[in-house]
Interface confidence: low
């Protein structure tokens, strides 16, 4: 019993003056609390609590359930306790069968004894099964049996409290241990799509999947740089014991341009946090942007191949593509394909393959594409470089020699005179007149050039060469010239 120091409040005194008291079932429990400032008696066992304002606690016929801690408290808040065991051979354990353990923490199997003098107070597996080898426990007759450092593997473990009574093993009712897993990693979060492109008024719906060991993981959708609470719906599943999945679906029923931005699905547990983002872009209407992959002005040599290539972005998906030349639509020689097979792809490539181009096939080649909202087009101007061709070479009635040549780029015509019958002419002759005949015509065809010289300048027999040339090549025509005789053209000769 506590000793009394005058002038200082002291705890109450209890009779009988023991810390523990053992009574038999059916006997009387009589406890007296002596204190001038007595307030109350309190009885506690498991989750049960009773109070008594009388300073003497009397239970006429004790039962096993009267086993527990009796505490007397005074007005100074000081208290004193006695633990009473009510020995009942038919009820050795008081039990609270709820048993939850947090992974890596200790948990109490609540099976306090009614008789402290029984032996071998311990835990046993149900149906004779052994307990896990690493399971350690500490018995306490007044509280139960403490399992140390609960493991995830103990989940759903069935066990009994056990004592030996008169050489026989007596088991309590069974307990099923439910283990609450500890978070040992951040949640795993994923999103249904990393980016969304929508038109105004369309529905935006995105699902975030959160996976963790238990349902106590926290998750939410947030808009970056905004505190606005977003409306989301949840579905969840337990796939086995420590495999929890939640789907958080964010929906904007009619998206607007100013809803565009980055949305973050955020999840955290006691270990840490994780997040994943998706980007929403809302456009007021669909679009098509076309980008040429080669210069839109193309020069190609006669007989060569060229590929006209465009890359384009189309949203919604392109519905109609075509390549056109001279109001004619190509049915083949072109291909159109998405740049990636990703479901959110908006980039496409179109290629027109022009083979063995002729001088007559220069012109404007146009790629057209449309979707449900817009049309777009891009034009390529194709110039076919051709070696000059001499179309005519004549002596005119006025004594002029005239040479007409066609090619692209525009040919240059030079004149040479060779004395005698040499066909290797070097002395150049200045033309009297040079004209480009069709410069006002279509810009893509061959350009025709006419050049004239005055034959009266020649005083000797010989050969006159008309040479037409450009960047691609050259062609010559020859005139045999006899002084004071008719000039007649020679067979066209191309070196």
């Amino acid at each position: 019993q506590p000793s009394v120091s005058p002038g200082e409040p002291s705890p109450p005194s209890i009779h009988p003056g023991k810390s523990d008291l053992i009574v038999r079932v059916g006997d009387e429990i009589r406890l007296l609390c002596t204190d001038p400032g007595f307030v109350k008696w309190t009885f506690e066992i498991l989750d049960e609590t009773n109070e008594n304002k009388q300073n003497e606690w009397i239970t006429e016929k004790a039962e096993a359930t009267n086993t527990g801690k009796y505490t007397c408290t005074n007005k100074h808040g000081l208290s004193n306790s006695i633990y009473v065991f009510v020995r009942d051979p038919a009820k050795l354990f008081l039990v609270d069968r709820s048993l939850y353990g947090k992974e890596d923490n200790d948990t109490l199997v609540r099976c306090p004894l009614t008789d402290p003098e029984v032996t071998n107070y311990s835990l046993k597996g149900c149906q004779g099964k052994p307990l896990p080898k690493d399971l350690r426990f500490i018995p306490d007759p007044k509280a139960g049996i403490m399992i140390k450092s609960v493991k995830r593997a103990y989940h759903r473990l069935c066990l009994h409290c056990s004592v030996d009574q008169e050489g026989k093993s007596v088991l309590s009712e069974k307990f099923i241990l439910k283990v609450r897993p500890a978070f040992k990693a951040v949640p795993v979060v994923s999103v249904s799509k990393a980016s969304y492109l929508l038109r105004e008024g369309e529905e935006f719906t995105v699902t975030c999947t959160i996976k963790d060991v238990s349902s106590s993981v926290y998750s939410t959708w947030k808009r970056e740089n905004s505190q606005t609470k977003l409306q989301e719906k949840y579905n969840s599943w337990h796939h086995g014991d420590f495999n929890y999945e939640r789907q958080a679906t964010l929906t904007i029923s009619s998206a607007r341009v100013n809803d565009s931005g980055v949305f973050m699905c955020y999840a955290n547990n006691t270990f840490g946090s994780a997040n994943v983002t998706t980007t929403l872009e809302v456009v007021d209407k669909g679009f098509i942007n076309i980008f040429p992959m080669i210069n839109t002005t193309v020069f190609v040599n006669d007989g060569e191949n060229v590929d006209l290539i465009v890359e384009y972005e189309a949203f919604p998906k392109p519905e109609h593509q075509q390549w056109i030349y001279m109001n004619r639509t190509f049915t083949d020689k072109w291909e159109d394909y998405p740049k990636s097979e990703n479901e959110s792809n908006i980039r496409y490539v179109s290629e027109l393959h022009l083979t063995r181009l002729k001088g007559t096939e220069g012109g404007t080649y146009t790629f057209l594409v449309s979707n449900s909202d817009v049309n777009a087009a891009i034009a390529f101007n194709v110039y076919v470089n051709t070696k000059p061709e001499i179309l005519t070479y004549d002596r005119l009635v006025n004594g002029m020699l005239q040479c007409v040549a066609a090619g692209f780029p525009e040919p240059t015509i030079d004149w040479y005179f060779c004395p005698g019958t040499e066909q290797r002419c070097s002395a150049s002759v200045l033309p009297v007149d040079v004209q480009t005949l069709n410069s006002s015509g279509p810009p893509f065809g061959k350009l025709v050039v006419q050049s004239s010289i005055d034959s009266s300048a020649f005083k000797h027999n010989g050969t006159v060469e008309c040479k037409a040339y450009n960047d691609v090549g050259k062609t010559s025509a020859y005139f045999n010239f006899a002084f004071k005789e008719q000039i007649h053209p020679h067979t066209l000769f191309t070196p």
Epitope: S195, S260, V262, T279, E281, F287, I288, N289, I290, F291, P292, Y312, E313, R347, A376, I378
Partner: antibody, heavy 122, light 106 residues
Framework: EVQLVESGGGLVQPGGSLRLSCAAS????????MAWVRQAPGKGLEWVAS????????YYLDSVRGRFTISRDNAKNSLYLQMNSLRAEDTAVYYC???????????????WGQGTTVTVSS | DIQMTQSPSSLSASVGDRVTITCRAS??????LNWYQQKPGKAPKLLIY???RLQSGVPSRFSGSGSGTDFTLTISSLQPEDFATYYC????????FGGGTKVEIK
């Protein structure tokens, strides 16, 4: 020669107004997208506003929307920026820029003026 | 809004060095990226548009690459006239510039 010349900058008190002008020459002004870009002392470039040549649509930086107005007069080959309720953070060199395009709707700024200085201070 | 982040903010290099500047967008901007050069007291000058297309009159030692969110400007052999500040700019949703990279003489 393609040229853009800005004018109208100066010192103004917070809350005051200024009107910047940009005179264009050497190209067909009405065919081009135009924009204003600014640069605070010792800082980087910041797009402020732009105007589409075909639709007349205007676009603004969030922090200037409602205070600044971009406009153009194609007959005078001129671009304007009316700046009201000026703040200290609007202090910058303001450049006028021409937008050229690649593809069908993708713009970049290929010609810039030399800039005009706006100082907002009490 | 789309944020553009340039790195490094400054670098020192010598004539003849190969210089690489990176630009990262806060969300995908496809290939809608331009690069500008600015010298002190001067207006910016367009170098590259649509990620890799060289503006007329710009020397071929300048090149650009990338797509989506990550882009690079490379100067293959730095010349004395290349010491300047370089800015990237996105054109996907309106316009925004990176913070700039100052290329200084070592």
């Amino acid at each position: 020669e393609v040229q853009l010349v800005e004018s109208g900058g100066g010192l103004v008190q917070p809350g005051g107004s200024l009107r910047l002008s940009c005179a264009a020459s050497g190209f067909t002004f009405s065919d081009y997208y135009m924009a204003w870009v600014r640069q605070a002392p010792g800082k980087g470039l910041e797009w402020v506003a732009s105007i589409n040549q075909n639709t007349g649509s205007t676009y603004y930086l969030d922090s200037v929307r409602g205070r600044f107005t971009i406009s153009r007069d194609n007959a005078k080959n001129s671009l304007y920026l009316q700046m009201n309720s000026l703040r200290a953070e609007d202090t910058a060199v303001y450049y006028c820029a021409r937008g050229d395009y690649y593809g069908t709707t993708y713009w970049y700024f290929d010609v810039w003026g030399q800039g005009t200085t706006v100082t907002v201070s009490s | 809004d789309i944020q553009m982040t340039q790195s490094p903010s400054s670098l020192s290099a010598s004539v003849g060095d190969r210089v690489t500047i990176t630009c990262r967008a806060s969300q995908s901007i496809s290939s809608y990226l331009n690069w500008y050069q600015q010298k002190p007291g001067k207006a910016p000058k367009l170098l590259i548009y649509y990620t890799s297309r060289l503006q007329s009159g710009v020397p071929s030692r300048f090149s650009g690459s990338g797509s989506g969110t990550d882009f690079t400007l490379t100067i293959s052999s730095l010349q004395p006239e290349d010491f300047a500040t370089y800015y990237c700019q996105q054109g996907r949703r309106l316009w925004s510039f990176g913070g700039g990279t100052k290329v200084e003489i070592k």
